[in-house]
Amino acid sequence: QGWQAFKNDATEIIPELGEYPEPPPELENNKTMNRAENGGRPPHHPFETKDVSEYSCRELHFTRYVTDGPCRSAKPVTELVCSGQCGPARLLPNAIGRGKWWRPSGPDFRCIPDRYRAQRVQLLCPGGEAPRARKVRLVASCKCKRLTRFHNQSELKDFGTEAARPQKGRKPRPRARSAKANQAELENAY
């Protein structure tokens, strides 16, 4: 589709001051007939440390229209942007407020997309062209990952390990694909 890169995993976004926004609500649907029993993804907890909340990263909402060539979504979509750096949860708000940032002395920790979700969008096109329907890939949540080699995004590692599991409880998609991002119009960012 020739999309320009919209955001890059390595780009650090400095979060605004203020409270941590809630992730967007799950899409409402009534598709229950053929679901796997107890379906749905459980919350993913990559921090297999003594304190699950030891590391934290910020999830910020932003709202934008999505485009496909000359066509634009009828309504804006809301997704999350993940701030670039991770730190102990208890330090993040104050440290940001003081203009400082906690950095680990050992491996680098990055805040990157964890879960993705699909959202149906209708795209309106100019010149009487028929509308289009697409399913857009949106960031649904963020997580901290350890960067074992400096600035090598392919080396991002989870805190924990994984084994075989039913897809109904599968691990969410772990990272964004910036190479295929779209030409987005930022609207009411954050």
């Epitope: 589709q1 999309w3 799950e26 899409l27 649907n29 598709k31 007939m33 053929n34 679901r35 796997a36 379906g39 749905g40 993804r41 496909d68 879960r115 993705y116 979700r117 699909a118 959202q119 149906r120 209708q122 028929a130 509308p131 289009r132 329907a133 697409r134 399913k135 857009v136 890939r137 039913p166 897809q167 109904k168 599968r170 691990k171 969410p172 998609r173 772990p174 990272r175 694909r177 295929k180 991002a181 779209n182």
Partner: antibody
Framework: EVQLVQSGAEVKKPGASVKVSCKVS????????IHWVRQAPGKGLEWMGG????????IYAQKFQGRVTMTEDTSTDTAYMELSSLRSEDTAVYYC??????????????WGQGTLVTVSS | QAVVTQEPSLTVSPGGTVTLTCGSS?????????PYWFQQKPGQAPRTLIS???DKHSWTPARFSGSLLGGKAALTLSGAQPEDEAEYYC?????????FGGGTKLTVL
Amino acid sequence: EVQLVQSGAEVKKPGASVKVSCKVSGYTLSELSIHWVRQAPGKGLEWMGGFDPEDGETIYAQKFQGRVTMTEDTSTDTAYMELSSLRSEDTAVYYCATDSAGYWYKFFQHWGQGTLVTVSS
Amino acid sequence: QAVVTQEPSLTVSPGGTVTLTCGSSTGAVTIDHYPYWFQQKPGQAPRTLISDTDDKHSWTPARFSGSLLGGKAALTLSGAQPEDEAEYYCLLDYGGSFVFGGGTKLTVL
């Protein structure tokens, strides 16, 4: 580029189970939405089930409910499809297929080479 | 479960134009069914030609196009080539559950 490599052909007896594997390369399995499709000899394609990212669940075709289980091992980037209580009409080539991990969700973009499962007494 | 219908077979002359259609037992096919079209040649896995009604892929020849036509999804082949002789399947999305059509055997003669 996403590539899918499936396990080899299987011969099973009626009533048995079969587990077909689908090894992902080019992306990690967690980044993709895997679906399973089968094709009986000389017949058309039949969707069995797959992961629906709209509400984060695996959804199975009604016809296979209770007989099929789709799992994954993210440590080896391998997806599995297990079909139980096999009957002769389950003889088919079983395909895994996945999206292309792009900005728009487009499913069934990449296909495995297929695994022939023969059910015969 | 919905039934998706296609013409069992169609014939086109080399260089000619042919339209394959895909209907749904539940009513008119719309963009919200995200129609897919696949081509399959004997002994090969299917390959996607069209997604989301009209979206071609990098490997889709320009002579193929997707659309909605009279309450059905349609695949139009303009300027048929001998190598286009194959089975063609449509696929419709019913809220995350997918149903394939029975397939159309296209002969280029």
